[in-house]
């Protein structure tokens, strides 16, 4: 469960992927498109809104009764708008929606090599935001063997 | 309860080697990255060194880069430092540190052990 | 690398006061930065995390401020058992790196 309705820092941050493309975001038709591409040297990268919340592991998994705390990330590139996890599809997917947010919207937030970050899915553990052939997807992982693949880890940049 | 114990410190000589344990308890150690923070007597904390939960990525602070190595053995619920080259400027206590969050580290430092005490000195 | 000044270095306060310290960062951080408080003898604990989320255990008097460069921590009315020596700590991106440290005394 998320502890508490409010995030506990929010930040605005372009995302780029680890190979320096950038996530960007286009109104088509009265929806937006999420793209990853090389930008031009002068054009201003996106910003996305970063809100963090703090959730609870159930004991069970982290085995520290109520010490096990995750982070969450929301993350929104304009106004009432969220990137969510479409598992069905395999898809991330930018929707409008009203608080509270729907627990698609939510991603356990992973540190990574290199200063870099990676985006869980809270509704499908071992499913990550990644690339995959230039627009973005949900990537199953094998925690095991791939958790450093570079096409799940992404740079934040202020 | 968490619990951090530290071993392995002692005087040794300029140039000489060390190797600190931290034996945790209480929590799953995999599920966390873990720090070494050393502390010089009478001064500031310095962050040392930290290792992701699997091992798999390590960093280190410039002043012990290519002197120092981290490690850990999930299966032991230890973690491991181990202090080469040492110069006396590396006196310290030594505490290992445990992170707020499982899968990041942006929290700080939420568990820490006792220390234990390396001196180098002649 | 991402260098951390605490200032003052530090302060003498009575019993009530108002106490600020200011951490700020060579570049920016967000929000990523912790407070610790050492006591002589002890080892420090987490005060502060995320720049302003309090850690349990700690009371309401101690908080917290700032994103970007600039952070803050208060003692809105300085306690017998608050006289410690406080640390921030950027945790944004390696090297992690700390502030040299404030000592809070009695006047």
């Known amino acids: 469960s998320i502890t508490g309705i409010s995030p506990i820092t929010e930040s605005l941050a372009s995302l780029s992927t680890y190979n320096d493309q950038s996530i960007t975001f286009a109104l088509e038709d009265e929806s937006y498109e999420i793209y990853v591409e090389d930008l031009k040297k002068d054009k201003k990268k996106d910003k996305v809104l970063l809100s963090y919340y703090e959730s609870q592991h159930p004991s069970s998994e982290s085995g520290d009764g109520v010490d096990g705390k995750m982070l969450m990330v929301t993350l929104s590139p304009t106004k009432d708008f969220w990137l969510q996890a479409n598992n069905k599809e395999h898809s991330v997917e930018l929707h409008k929606c009203e608080k509270p947010l729907p627990d698609q919207a939510f991603f356990v937030l992973h540190n990574r090599s290199f200063n870099c970050v990676s985006f869980e899915c809270k509704t499908d553990p071992g499913v990550f935001i990644g690339v995959k052939d230039n627009h973005l997807a949900l990537i199953k992982v094998d925690y095991s063997e791939n958790l450093g693949s570079e096409n799940i880890l992404f740079k934040l940049s202020e | 309860e968490v619990q951090l114990v530290e071993s392995g410190g002692g005087l040794v000589q300029p140039g000489g080697s060390l190797r600190l344990s931290c034996a945790a308890s209480g929590f799953t150690l995999s599920s966390y990255a873990m720090s070494w923070v050393r502390q010089a007597p009478g001064k500031g904390l310095e962050w040392v060194s930290a290792?992701?939960?699997?091992?798999?990525?390590?960093y280190y602070a410039d002043s012990v880069k290519g002197r120092f190595t981290i490690s850990r053995d999930n299966s032991k619920n230890s973690l491991y430092l181990q202090l080469n080259s040492l110069r006396a400027e590396d006196t310290a206590v030594y505490y290992c540190a445990k992170t707020l969050y499982t899968t990041s580290w942006y929290g700080g430092f939420q568990h820490w052990g006792q220390g234990t005490l390396v001196t180098v000195s002649s | 690398d991402i260098q951390m000044t605490q200032s003052p270095s530090s302060v003498s306060a009575s019993i009530g006061d108002r106490v600020t310290i200011t951490c700020r960062a060579s570049q920016g951080i967000s929000s990523w930065l912790a407070w610790y408080q050492q006591k002589p003898g002890k080892v420090p604990k987490l005060?502060?995390?995320?720049?302003?989320s309090l850690q349990s255990g700690f009371p309401s008097r101690f908080s917290g401020s700032g994103s970007g460069t600039d952070f803050t921590l208060t003692i809105s009315s300085l306690q017998p058992e608050d006289f410690a020596t406080y640390y921030c700590?950027?945790?944004?991106?390696?090297?992690?790196?700390v502030g040299q440290g404030t000592k809070v005394e009695i006047k």
């Open positions: 700590q950027q945790t944004h991106s390696f090297p992690w790196t």
């Open positions: 005060l502060i995390y995320a720049a302003s």
């Open positions: 290792i992701s939960g699997s091992g798999g990525s390590t």
